[in-house]
Interface confidence: low
């Protein structure tokens, strides 16, 4: 008799999810000597344990604690780059500026980047058909709770000047409902963080507007200031030139506005 299966609104678990997580873990520990001690089989077991046999709308941060413990990693707290709706450029930047880190440059972020996963209550099966959508089904789903957990921890670890890359092409440059707006902003520690510096990335070639004056940026400034953290903002008019100048700061053209 075929078993009835809950149909969710979101896409199902990424195909070959267990193999992918394990392979990513092995590759990450090969590339990062400071994480060579990590036992990737234990990491996968802890990851699996967070959502397998559990109702995919009833996941808690507590479920991920064993994984968080195994993935504990020290990154320089003053070299953290947050981002919102502009992941690719943020990642391109940290590949050039090797001493800065996005969440996806850490083991746990790297493992889960771009993947979807969920299980089913009372069975050890992974659901490859569908998983809960954050809006249409429930917010306490395995993927959302994972990113909320690791994002909170990442923001809590930050110190000194924290940078955030924001997408100037979007209607809401700062979105209170994004992971940055709803989790990271509120978990920066005022006793450790002196300044949040926003880099607003322009999309259009001829766009010379000062997007730091955008109402949503002013809203971000207000939230940050109320938390006793200073705020600064820079327009990045030419993201291509920006990356080039990070790579070759001696270049004479890099003294002009980017």
């Amino acid at each position: 008799v075929p078993r009835w299966r809950q149909q969710w609104s979101g896409p199902g678990t990424t195909k070959r999810f267990p193999e992918t997580v394990l392979a990513r873990c092995v590759k990450y520990t090969e590339i990062h000597p400071e994480m060579r001690h990590v036992d990737c089989q234990s990491v996968w077991d802890a990851f699996k344990g967070a959502f397998i046999s559990k109702h995919p709308c009833n996941i808690t941060e507590e479920d991920y604690q064993p994984l968080m413990k195994l993935g504990t990693q020290t990154v320089p707290c003053n070299k953290i780059l947050l981002w919102s709706r502009i992941k690719d450029l943020a990642h391109q930047f940290t590949q050039v500026q090797r001493d800065m880190f996005t969440l996806e440059d850490t083991l746990l972020g790297y493992l889960a980047d771009d993947l979807t996963w969920c299980g089913e209550f009372n069975t050890s099966k992974i659901n490859y058909q569908s998983c809960p959508d954050w809006r249409k089904d429930c917010s306490n789903n395995p993927v959302s709770v994972f990113w909320k957990t690791v994002s909170r921890r990442f923001a809590e670890a930050a110190c000194d000047v924290v940078h955030v890359m924001l997408n100037g092409s979007r209607s809401k440059i700062f979105d209170k409902n994004s992971t940055f707006g709803s989790v990271e902003v509120h978990n920066l520690q005022p006793e450790k963080v002196q300044t949040l510096e926003a880099w607003v990335i322009h999309g259009g070639r001829e766009d010379s507007r000062d997007l730091c004056q955008d109402p949503t940026i002013k809203e971000l400034e207000s939230i940050i200031s109320k938390r006793n953290i200073q705020f600064s903002c820079k327009n990045i008019y030419r993201p291509d030139k920006f990356l080039q100048c990070v790579k070759n700061p001696e270049d004479s053209s890099c003294t002009s506005e980017i």
């Epitope: 992918t20 392979a23 690719d88 391109q92 590949q95 790297y110 980047d113 771009d114």
Partner: nanobody
Framework: QVQLVESGGGLVQPGGSLRLSCAAS????????MHWLRQAPGKEREWVAV????????YYADSVKGRFTISRDNSKNTLYLQMNSLRVEDTAVYYC?????????????????WGQGTLVTVSS
């Protein structure tokens, strides 16, 4: 449309060298990580090497480390694989593939575009 075209394969003796090329078109080549993979007759496709979007990071499978070199020329939209000290077990169809990102995750689950492959035969 988006396309990857490999060339440079052929028959070579053990210990010999070959240089494979992969010409990319239809996307911003300089923005993405690029991979080489291979598939030997009757075997699963195997990841060979990856290079980040700007060429600063390169990683290799243990089986080719020290013998193969991946490189790219973003001005020519071309990816290369220099293969030295070739062995009989290197015989395979070699594919280039585009990563979905700058090269954050170097396993093949992130590949979204493949070439048609070029055959490399190592035999005496």
């Amino acid at each position: 449309q988006v396309q990857l075209v490999e060339s440079g394969g052929g028959l070579v003796q053990p210990g010999g060298s070959l240089r494979l090329s992969c010409a990319a078109s239809g996307f911003t080549f300089s923005g993405y990580g690029m991979h080489w993979l291979r598939q030997a007759p009757g075997k699963e496709r195997e990841w060979v090497a990856v290079i980040s979007y700007d060429g600063s990071n390169k990683y290799y499978a243990d089986s080719v480390k020290g013998r193969f070199t991946i490189s790219r020329d973003n001005s020519k939209n071309t990816l290369y694989l220099q293969m030295n000290s070739l062995r009989v077990e290197d015989t395979a169809v070699y594919y280039c593939a585009k990563d979905r990102g700058t090269m954050r995750v170097v396993v093949y689950d992130t590949l979204d575009i493949w070439g048609q492959g070029t055959l490399v035969t190592v035999s005496s």
